[in-house]
């Protein structure tokens, strides 16, 4: 059986479509499973990975690496 | 379960801003984008917005670029959506949506606000 | 920005009838595409996603079909709490536009 495109899976019915754009930085195993691409994490891979050692409370990433400091906070790391 | 609630109806003038909330309960509030949809009295579905709560990311309808601003508050769980330079044609109910798990689109949505702008 | 031409924007039927309602996107959306019900006064619920895909508790008198830029919901005997206002939405790349919706009335 050959499964439409994004289908996979015993049946075709695990939906899977690599993306990598806001909504989603992922590729699709040959189960239609996402599989993160580097810097991102979540169930949808949409959220990045900020710098190691980035304060959760205080410090947040729009990009991978990155660490930027809720306002009140200041240095590498937001701490 | 998932839930949004979002604050109550608002009267506002033309030229001034307003500034929806949006309070998600029952999952991992950074894991998923927030997004704002709106529906003007007897018109269809708009989509405004999203923002990625983690970082703070955003992507806006090219209509409400510049006069729309989405934010979150990670401690409190909470979405908002601040909507400036309002005119009688912003007059709507607003939206709160999430999609769902596996990529479906808006699987949980809010009760809706309804922004009435009237001079 | 993809557009979606919903078809028609209001319709009348009866119970037991068969309905199709259909949805035309301006570039090929790769089956990203939902249908959302949406009572009066009430927040949309979604029906279909992934143009086929059945969502939690919709019966299955619902169905979704079509690939491509060409997709269609039918209703394959309506029932009195189905007459409602009917959408879909692609969510393919953003802008996430919405079709017109399609009002389904009591004949």
């Known amino acids: 059986v050959t499964c439409d495109d994004y289908y996979y899976g015993f049946g075709c019915n695990k939906f899977c479509r690599p993306r990598d754009d806001f909504f989603g930085h992922y590729a699709c195993d040959q189960n239609g499973n996402k599989t993160c691409m580097e810097g991102w994490m979540g169930p949808e891979c949409n959220r990045a990975i900020c710098r190691q050692g980035c304060s959760p409370k205080h410090g947040s990433c729009k990009l991978p690496g990155d660490c930027r400091c809720q306002y009140g906070w200041q240095g590498l790391y937001c701490d | 379960q998932v839930q949004l609630v979002q604050s109550g109806a608002e009267v506002k003038k033309p030229g001034s801003s307003v500034k929806v909330s949006c309070k998600a309960s029952g999952y991992t509030f950074t894991d998923y984008e927030m997004h704002w949809v709106r529906q003007a009295p007897g018109q269809g579905l708009e989509w405004m917005g999203a923002?990625?709560?983690?970082?703070?990311?955003?992507a806006y309808a090219q209509k409400f670029q510049g006069r729309v601003t989405l934010t979150a508050d990670k401690s409190t769980s909470t979405a908002y959506m601040e909507l400036s330079s309002l005119r009688s044609e912003d007059t709507a109910v607003y939206y709160c949506?999430?999609?769902?798990?596996?990529?479906?689109?808006?699987?949980?949505w809010g009760q809706g606000t309804l922004v009435t702008v009237s001079s | 920005d993809i557009q979606m031409t919903q078809s028609p924007s209001s319709l009348s039927a009866s119970v037991g009838d068969r309905v199709t309602i259909t949805c035309r996107a301006s570039?090929?959306?790769?089956?990203?595409l939902a249908w959302y019900q949406q009572k009066p006064g009430k927040a949309p619920k979604l029906l279909i996603y992934n143009a086929k895909t059945l969502a939690d508790a919709v019966p299955s008198r619902f169905s979704g079909s079509g690939s491509g830029t060409d997709y269609t919901l039918t209703i394959s005997s309506l029932q009195p709490e189905d007459f409602a206002t009917y959408y879909c939405q692609h969510f393919w790349s953003a802008p996430w536009t919405f079709g017109g919706g399609t009002k389904l009335e009591i004949k």
């Open positions: 570039g090929n959306i790769h089956n990203y």
């Open positions: 949506t999430r999609r769902g798990y596996d990529d479906y689109p808006f699987a949980y």
């Open positions: 923002i990625q709560p983690g970082g703070g990311g955003t």
